[in-house]
């Protein structure tokens, strides 16, 4: 797999010396979570008569939250570790000036991987030990000397699982946008057999190759709005745990039987993929169980058939496609592969031929969407917890996440000079980058209005001189009179307002008599009640869409389809003078107040809806007894 003269395996290649573009200046003390490899990096490659500029971003979602590695220790015992501080050197990105381009590379020891421009797939790998600036070979997949590989999944095994194959099903989506649905996640467990381990020579080499492969697979699936996240890697560095046969169907059966036995003590995952160094019989390089994703049979076997890891990545993407319900393209009448190059094939072609595919056909996408409608696909919906992802959150997504000081979007979008868009850290000398109380990269002085009062139940908020964010929105004390009612958590709930909210502008509160009884399931009037805090009763307006109603005389109540539950009068609604609905009963306003809260605010604030002092501009919480400037001076801290 890694011979001493890699170029001996290429028919034609071009020698390039990649040039790394200088990144934006960053603060000298980079946070430790940024690791040794930068968050983003760009390279210029002169190849095929063009200067290609590759913009790459570290794939921070490559490894799942509880990522584990399992191997055999020197004493023969099986060891499972959760590696700490998992910095890595696997990147994804695009080529500048080519809208539909893609790139997936590792930068660990020189550049290795692929970049796609239009219909051309370029592979790159180092020719010597010169690192990222040294000599590299850039070549097209068809110039890699290898035999064509086929998938062992037969038409017979597909037929009953996939249903009729007609051209009419496959309507191409307009443009090349992602499918309009939730991003799905495949939590992947990879097993590497002993033959592959022997071929690569060390755990480190295996780990590097597997991460490279999964990075490529993830990039291929992103076009389908999928992410492939590695949650576990098992390396059989001592001996195989089951017989890996040259017959791929036998090996798959053995893998799935072994996996079923291991499931209780191994990582929970959606899919298992074996990478083997065993040469499968004939031209077969992969075999999978069709439509098995999320089941106990969710898995496939892949022969590492090519010197370049992109080869086994394409095989894995293909076999995982079968797990996701996809058929071979050539089995589907009217199937369109939008590859434009000569003999271009898509990922689900039965044979990969001499060039690696880089996209899914229209029919693969249709099969996938169909599979996702099945209840079994639910395991793909759970998004990884970003706060736990090894490698951390995503810089450039407009969310300030763990370890980030700011996030102004991708570099192409960011116009915020206070934030370094490449690292999501504050620019040199900046105190802040976002927030209503941040101006010109500095925190605004205490007392500046940052959120005006929006109605009679609201309170205005002021900057505190220390934080770039406006303080949390606070409201008038519950029970403060407002138009026709009493303030409650910032709202002014009245029966009339509630009826309008559901029934539209013509909605009104029903007659008082409508509120004098409760309703039992099945729209039956029941026992008398003495207040207006039961079921919300309205008249007039338009019946809300998708809601069932219960009509008794002129009283209209909203109910569930089965008539067992009713829309209640909300908490805080006025039910009489100085009275509000509270816990289903009409009670005195004093239920809101445990004490005279405002007396604690030293005449420099009022009580809010949380029974806390809300200070006037420039005064410090909690009791508005001191000026903010005095408090800051005493603590001696900068914002």
């Amino acid at each position: 797999i890694a011979p001493s003269r890699p170029w001996a395996l290429m028919e034609q290649y071009e020698v390039v010396l990649p040039w790394r573009l200088p990144g934006p200046r960053v603060r000298r003390a980079l946070p430790s979570h940024l690791g040794l490899h930068p968050e983003r990096v760009s390279y210029v490659l002169g190849a095929t008569g063009h200067n290609f500029t590759l913009h790459l971003r570290k794939n921070r979602d490559l490894l799942g939250s509880g990522y584990t590695e399992t191997y055999t220790a020197a004493n023969g015992s099986e060891v499972t570790e959760q590696p700490r501080g998992q910095d890595h050197c696997f990147y994804q990105g695009h080529v500048e000036g080519y809208p539909d381009s893609a790139a997936s590379l590792s930068t660990c020891a020189g550049l290795r991987g692929f970049f796609q421009v239009g219909s051309d797939l370029h592979l790159i790998e180092p020719l010597d030990e010169g690192g990222e600036g040294g000599r590299h070979a850039v070549y097209q997949a068809e110039h890699l000397l290898q035999t064509a590989g086929t998938c062992g999944v037969s038409d017979d095994s597909l037929g009953s699982l996939l249903g009729p194959r007609t051209a009419a099903v496959f309507r191409p989506r307009p443009g090349d946008s992602l499918p309009s649905r939730e991003t799905r996640y495949v939590e992947l467990y990879v097993v590497v057999d002993n033959a592959e381990f022997q071929m690569l020579g060390s755990e480190a080499a295996v780990r590097h190759r597997v991460l490279e492969v999964v990075n490529h697979v993830d990039k291929l699936y992103q076009k389908l709005n999928f992410r492939v996240v590695l949650v576990g890697l098992e390396i059989w560095n001592s001996q195989d745990r089951f017989h890996v046969s040259p017959d791929p169907s036998v090996t798959l059966e053995n893998l799935l039987t072994w996996q079923a036995r291991q499931r209780t003590r191994r990582h929970l995952h959606d899919n298992v993929q074996l990478i083997t160094g065993v040469d499968f019989t004939g031209t077969t390089v992969g075999f999978a169980r069709v439509s098995a994703m999320c089941s106990h049979s969710s898995g496939a076997v892949n022969q590492d058939h090519s010197k370049n890891p992109v080869g086994v990545a394409c095989t894995m993407a293909h076999e995982m496609g079968h797990n996701l319900g996809m058929d071979h393209d050539e089995n589907v009448q009217g199937c369109r592969c939008q590859e434009r190059f000569e003999a271009g094939r898509c990922i689900m072609a039965g044979s990969i031929g001499s060039s690696f595919p880089r996209m899914f056909s229209d029919c693969s996408q249709a099969y996938l969407e169909s599979f996702l409608e099945r209840p079994q696909s639910v395991c793909l919906a759970n998004a990884p917890d970003l706060s736990h992802l090894v490698g951390g959150p995503v810089c450039g997504n407009l969310f300030v996440e763990r370890g980030e000081q700011c996030d102004c979007g991708p570099p192409e979008d960011c116009r915020n000079r206070c934030c370094n868009s490449t690292t999501c850290q504050l620019a040199e000398g900046a105190q802040c980058a976002h927030g209503t109380c941040c101006q010109e990269c500095k925190v605004k002085p205490a007392g500046e209005l940052c959120r005006p009062k929006k109605d009679m139940c609201d309170l205005e908020e002021f900057c505190d001189g220390r934080h770039p964010e406006c303080p949390e929105d606070a409201f008038q004390e519950n029970g403060t009179p407002c138009s026709g009612g009493y303030c409650y958590n910032g709202a002014c709930p009245t029966l009339a307002q509630q009826c309008q909210a559901f029934w539209g502008p013509g909605g009104q509160a029903a007659e008082e008599s409508c509120f004098s009884y409760d309703i039992l399931p099945g729209c039956k009037a029941s026992r008398y009640r003495a207040d207006m805090c039961g079921v919300l009763q309205c008249k007039g307006g338009q019946q809300p869409l998708g809601r069932a109603i219960c009509i008794v005389d002129v009283c209209h109540a909203l109910t569930t389809e089965d008539g067992t539950a009713y829309e209640p009068v909300p908490e805080g609604t006025r039910c009489g003078p100085e009275k509000v609905c509270w816990k289903g009963r009409c009670q005195d306003l004093h239920v809101y107040r445990s004490s005279n809260c405002s007396a604690q605010c030293h005449n420099h604030g009022v009580c809010n809806h949380k029974q806390e002092c809300h200070c006037h501009a420039g005064w410090a919480p909690p009791h508005c007894a001191k000026l903010l400037t005095e408090v800051h001076a005493a603590s001696g801290s900068l914002p």
Epitope: H55, R57, D61, H94, G175, D176, S177, L178, P179, S180, R181, E182, T183, Q222, N225, R227, A383, P384, L386, V394, C395, G396, N397, L398, F399, V400, C406, D407, C408, G409, P410, E412, D413, A433, H434
Partner: nanobody, 124 residues
């Protein structure tokens, strides 16, 4: 599947204000970058603003429009002030998963879900 429903459009005089709302349902709202786009008759769809925790604006609306969101209410807002006749357009709300950042949030192709739109007409 995320459903987006815009409201709040209407006819307003130049210099006036309007507040658009976009109610989202179906998925965890806080996992989405929310965007506003607009399209005037016979013109290309144009980026207006986007928001995660932080915000982006088109140069043409910076200082006049404010995007905000309420994760508890699953709603994103576009407060439009100092409106001009050239702001007349159909306004669309869009959502994009936060887990795969695009190259830019300023193009429609970056977003996974779209609302049906609400019309804003600014008269002179």
């Amino acid at each position: 599947e995320v459903q987006l429903v815009e409201s709040g459009g209407g006819l307003v005089q130049a210099g006036g204000s309007l507040r658009l709302s976009c109610a989202a349902s179906g998925r965890t709202f806080s996992n989405y970058v929310m965007g506003w786009f607009r399209q005037a008759p016979g013109k290309e769809r144009e980026f207006v603003a986007a928001m995660g925790d932080t915000t982006l604006y088109a140069d043409s609306v910076e200082g006049r429009f404010t995007i905000s969101r309420d994760n508890d209410q699953n709603t994103v807002y576009l407060q439009m002030s100092s409106l001009k006749p050239e702001d007349t357009a159909a306004y669309f709300c869009a959502a994009r998963s936060r887990f795969i950042p695009p190259l830019t949030f300023r193009t429609g192709g970056a977003y996974d879900y779209w609302g049906q739109g609400t019309q804003v007409t600014v008269s002179s």
